[in-house]
Structures are given as structure tokens and as C-alpha cells.
């Protein structure tokens, strides 16, 4: 004799999220009275979502009339789909009883797949700036996507990067997934306008892959380069030295000079001049009157540069009729405190 | 839905009435019987459906027996008295969201010595 | 086991008035929705008016209404006609799938 079936003609179902998910369910007899019920997962632990008879589901609409004679269509609409939904959802039949109803039938389950679209992905890079030749590590996340499979590539000015390391968790089944890789990059001088970028290709996204970047100049220091130079005599026992400050990034830089040792000027970069490459070019000039000085003069040029140590470069002025042009290099000097934020 | 197989009888001469359905299929709806005694309301008495899902009101239990074929629900009143004489009607469904309609005419039963 | 209470006996009803039969439950019926109610005349077959306390079975006309859930139901004829007259039963489910108990009914007459 025939008993009452309940038939979940589709073993699963692929849903965006936000979407609204199908859950198809039908029956092949009226018989027992009773009503439908629908849960997600099998087991004690199983979750209700929908039961024909009572209760308030706000997310769930059938998508026949119940109340309608004859009826036999017990499928469901789940609105606003979360990764949260993903499951196995199980149309159970009920035989009216007292207490409670009783179980009769189940379908064999419907497994509910979400396809959630991954969060743009975040790249940061390290937290102090690093000088060319060295190697920095810049980092991307992205989460809530759904399925595990996904696809991250590194880039720097278009170039695809190989030295990067890339996870997936959680390693096991869950609802939704979050990527995290670390990309190892090597800064060179000419990066003040290099970016890094960081591309996620996702099943959801339809060959429209996401993109995080970062630039490099937030991560970058190019430290300048000094050059003391004495211009020709302006004016009776007068002399022009110059104190060329070339190629530095960021432009946050002070400059001092020595004369013989003691601080004659400082001041702060401000009208400088930008290259191609991003970097900065600024130019100090001192007049000095040489009438003043008995014996030679030794002329510092030294600049802080985004809180380093200071460098230096030095001018040895000859007192005589006919000063002529001489630079030396001196070591690096520490005029003193990183701290000052002289901008 | 047509009923059909109610006569006079004897008390305690077994009865059985028949239902005769078309147009649905016995193996997706429930027959449920009611009947009327004269001058009195409608009664409830059981509703037959497959093997396992027939099911009768507490006061008709051993009274009633069920059986069904492919076209025909049968009720048998097991061992009739003069209380079981009543108006017997057949009705697809089996009540909550799948009520009784439509109904048979009807079947006059008599049971008298 | 469910005892369902159906007043009044009998009402009469001008045409174009309305009527009111009630029925209540000696508890909660099944799902609190599990009550129909039944038009029935001398000689014919009953008819399904309403089920699932509200639902308007299909053809019946929209001057009969029922609302109603748990122990209180009600059937409401407004603008009632003479093709009315007729007994009314209410027919409620327990918590038992064999749990169907009829009320007493309510004869209408209409003047």
C-alpha cells in the first residue's frame, strides 16, 4: 500500500548571499493530518526553521498557500541568505498526536551552499619606514567568503610578485572563510610612487577581482645626499656656500649650519623642489662675511631627515685673497634628539 | 464520494458500507465517515487512509473496523445495535487543513430487530 | 478528549441581517486553527463553509466568515439570505489525529 513520500528533488542548492534560497518540498499524500515541518541538519541538535502549524518564522514564506485544499507543495523561500544558512535543510512530515506530534517522514535533504562574496581585501604595510635595499613585509586580509576556494596574487607597479605567504582558515568546514598573506618586498630609490597590490579572485566576484593596495611611499625613506659647494666671491670680502640637499623622501627635514663647530643657522625644508621619482630636492645657502674670520673657516651642512641621525658634509673656507672651492665629507653626525618632529 | 450499502439489519449482523470515490487518488486523501442520527447532530467517526493511518474516535474503536481498495473505502460496523441506526456519509479528507469535502449523499442505516 | 460547546441551539435571522454562532472548545484545538464549520440542510449532504477557523473554502460565498483560534470560534452570516436557513456545525481538532468532535449545531432560520 502506498504511504505518504516527501520528495526534496534537489540534493542542493547554491545561493549568493543576500539572496533568497529555494527549498523545494513536496508531498504525495495528504495523509496523516499533520504539518510540515522544516529544520536545518538532522540529529537532536537540528535547528527549526519553519513549522506549518505554528510559530513565527519571519525570514521563511512557502511558496504555495497552506491553507489551500489539497496542497501538497511544502517549499520554502529563506530570505537575506548569510553564509550563516549553509546546510543540510530537511523537510520533515508530522503525524498529528497527543502530547506532542510525531515524527512520520523526512525528505532526504536539500544541501544549502552559499556563495559569499569576499570583503575588500585590507593591505597595511610595516608600522616605520624602511631605507632602499631593505626588505619590508606588507600583509592582506579579506574575509566572509564562501566557498574556501579562492585566489590572491601580489603585484608591485604591475609586477607579480613570488616571495609571499598566504593561509586560509579555518582549515575545516565553516560558514564563511577569511584569507591572510604576507608579501615580502624590496625597496629600491625609485619607489616613492611604487604600490603594492594585493588581488583576490573569488568564484563570486565573476572574473572582477578585488583590489587592495598600498603605496610605498608611506613605507619608504630615501635619506639625501649632501653637497657643500662656494659659490664665487658676491661682494667684498663676502662668500656664498651652498648646501645642496638631494634626492629625500618624506620631505620632513631640517637643516643646520656649523661654523667652526657652532650652530650659525637652522631651518626647515620647506620650498623644495620634487623629481620624477617622487623624492624631494632642497637648496641652503650661508653668506659668509670673511672679514670676520683671523683664520680658516670649517662650514658644516648638517640635516636631520625624518628623524635619523643627522648626517653631514663639510666646506673647508680658506681666508684668503682668493678663496678657492674644497669640500669634504665627515662622518655622520648626531646633532642630537630624534625626537623633534620639525616638519 | 457516494455511499452505498446501508439497509435495515439486525442488531449484532455485521454491516460493512462502502465509499465510492473518482477523480483522486485514494493513496493521497483520507475518507473520513460521519454520520446523523435521526433527529440528531452530525457525529464524527473515524478516518481511514493507507494501512497505518486509519484511525477511529474513542467511542467508535471496536465498533468500526476499515479497509480500503484502489477506488473504495469500506466501514464496517462490527456488531450493530439500535444506536448505530443513522444516516452514514463518506467525505474526502481527514480535518486540521485538509476538511471534509465533498460528501456523499448519504446512507440510511436501520438497525432493528 | 475534546468537547466542543456550539450556542446558540437555534437563532432567526431577518434577510439582510446577520448571524452569529459561536463554539468553544474544551481546550486549545489542534495548532489553534483546527475548527471548520459545516452548513448542512435536511435531506442533502453537509457542506464546508470554512476551515482553518478562517479560510473561506472555494465557492462559498463571502457573507459567511469565521474567525477565532484556540477555545473561541465564531461564524459570522452578514446580509443573510433566505437560501441560509439551514443547521450550522462546528467541527474541531484535538490534539489527537481521532480527536474530531462535532458541536451541537445551530439551526438559523431565516424570517
Known amino acids: 500500500e502506498e504511504e505518504l513520500q516527501v520528495i526534496q528533488p534537489d540534493k542542493s542548492v547554491l545561493v549568493a548571499a543576500g539572496e533568497t534560497a529555494t527549498l523545494r518540498c513536496t508531498a504525495t499524500s495528504l495523509i496523516p493530518v499533520g504539518p510540515i515541518q522544516w529544520f536545518r541538519g538532522a540529529g537532536p541538535g537540528r535547528e527549526l526553521i519553519y513549522n506549518q502549524k505554528e510559530g513565527h518564522f519571519p525570514r521563511v514564506t512557502t511558496v504555495s498557500d497552506l491553507t489551500k485544499r489539497n496542497n501538497m507543495d511544502f517549499s520554502i523561500r529563506i530570505g537575506n541568505i548569510t553564509p550563516a544558512d549553509a546546510g543540510t535543510y530537511y523537510c520533515v512530515k508530522f503525524r498529528k498526536g497527543s502530547p506532542d506530534d510525531v515524527e512520520f517522514k523526512s525528505g532526504a535533504g536539500t544541501e544549502l551552499s552559499v556563495r559569499a562574496k569576499p570583503s575588500a581585501p585590507v593591505v597595511s604595510g610595516p608600522a616605520a619606514r624602511a631605507t632602499p635595499q631593505h626588505t619590508v613585509s606588507f600583509t592582506c586580509e579579506s574575509h566572509g567568503f564562501s566557498p574556501r576556494d579562492i585566489t590572491l596574487k601580489w603585484f608591485k607597479n604591475g609586477n607579480e610578485l613570488s616571495d609571499f605567504q598566504t593561509n586560509v582558515d579555518p582549515v575545516g568546514e565553516s560558514v564563511s572563510y577569511s584569507i591572510h598573506s604576507t608579501a615580502k618586498v624590496v625597496l629600491t630609490r625609485e619607489d616613492v610612487h611604487s604600490q603594492v597590490i594585493c588581488e583576490v579572485a573569488h568564484v563570486t566576484l565573476q572574473g572582477d577581482p578585488l583590489r587592495g593596495t598600498a603605496n610605498l611611499s608611506e613605507t619608504i625613506r630615501v635619506p639625501p645626499t649632501l653637497e657643500v659647494t662656494q659659490q664665487p666671491v658676491r661682494a667684498e670680502n663676502q662668500v656664498n656656500v651652498t648646501c645642496q640637499v638631494r634626492k629625500f623622501y618624506p620631505q620632513r627635514l631640517q637643516l643646520t649650519w656649523l661654523e667652526n663647530g657652532n650652530v650659525s643657522r637652522t631651518e626647515t625644508a620647506s620650498t623644495v623642489t620634487e623629481n620624477k621619482d617622487g623624492t624631494y630636492n632642497w637648496m641652503s645657502w650661508l653668506l659668509v662675511n670673511v672679514s670676520a674670520h683671523r683664520d680658516d673657516v670649517k662650514l658644516t651642512c648638517q640635516v636631520e631627515h625624518d628623524g635619523q641621525p643627522a648626517v653631514s658634509k663639510s666646506h673647508d673656507l680658506k681666508v684668503s685673497a682668493h678663496p678657492k672651492e674644497q669640500g669634504s665629507n665627515t662622518a655622520a653626525e648626531n646633532t642630537g634628539s630624534n625626537e623633534r618632529n620639525i616638519y | 464520494v457516494e455511499e452505498s450499502g446501508g439497509r435495515l439489519v439486525t442488531p449484532g449482523t455485521p454491516l460493512t458500507l462502502t465509499c465510492t470515490v473518482s477523480g483522486f487518488s485514494l493513496s493521497s486523501h483520507g475518507i473520513s465517515w460521519v454520520r446523523q442520527a435521526p433527529g440528531k447532530g452530525l457525529e464524527y467517526i473515524g478516518t481511514i487512509g493507507t494501512g497505518v493511518i486509519t484511525y477511529f474516535a474513542s467511542w467508535a474503536k471496536g465498533r468500526f473496523t476499515g479497509s480500503k481498495t484502489s477506488t473504495t473505502v469500506d466501514l464496517k460496523i462490527t456488531s450493530p445495535t439500535t444506536e448505530d441506526t443513522a444516516t452514514y456519509f463518506c467525505?474526502?479528507?481527514?480535518?486540521?487543513?485538509?476538511?471534509?469535502?465533498?460528501w456523499g449523499p448519504g446512507t440510511l442505516v436501520t438497525v432493528s430487530s | 478528549a475534546l468537547v466542543m460547546t456550539q450556542t446558540p441551539a437555534s437563532v432567526s435571522a431577518a434577510v439582510g441581517g446577520t448571524v452569529t454562532t459561536k463554539c468553544q472548545a474544551s481546550q486549545s484545538v489542534y495548532g489553534n486553527n483546527d475548527l471548520a464549520w459545516y452548513q448542512h440542510k435536511p435531506g442533502q449532504p453537509p457542506k464546508l463553509l470554512i476551515y482553518?477557523?478562517?479560510t473561506l473554502a472555494t465557492g462559498v460565498p463571502s457573507r459567511f466568515s469565521g474567525s477565532g483560534s484556540g477555545t473561541q470560534f465564531t461564524l459570522t452570516i452578514t446580509g443573510v439570505q433566505s437560501d441560509d436557513a439551514a443547521t450550522y456545525y462546528c467541527?474541531?481538532?484535538?490534539?489527537?489525529?481521532?480527536?474530531?468532535?462535532f458541536g451541537g449545531g445551530t439551526e438559523v432560520v431565516v424570517k
Open positions: 467541527l474541531g481538532g484535538g490534539d489527537d489525529e481521532a480527536d474530531n468532535v
Open positions: 467525505a474526502r479528507g481527514s480535518a486540521w487543513n485538509d476538511p471534509f469535502d465533498p
Open positions: 482553518l477557523a478562517s
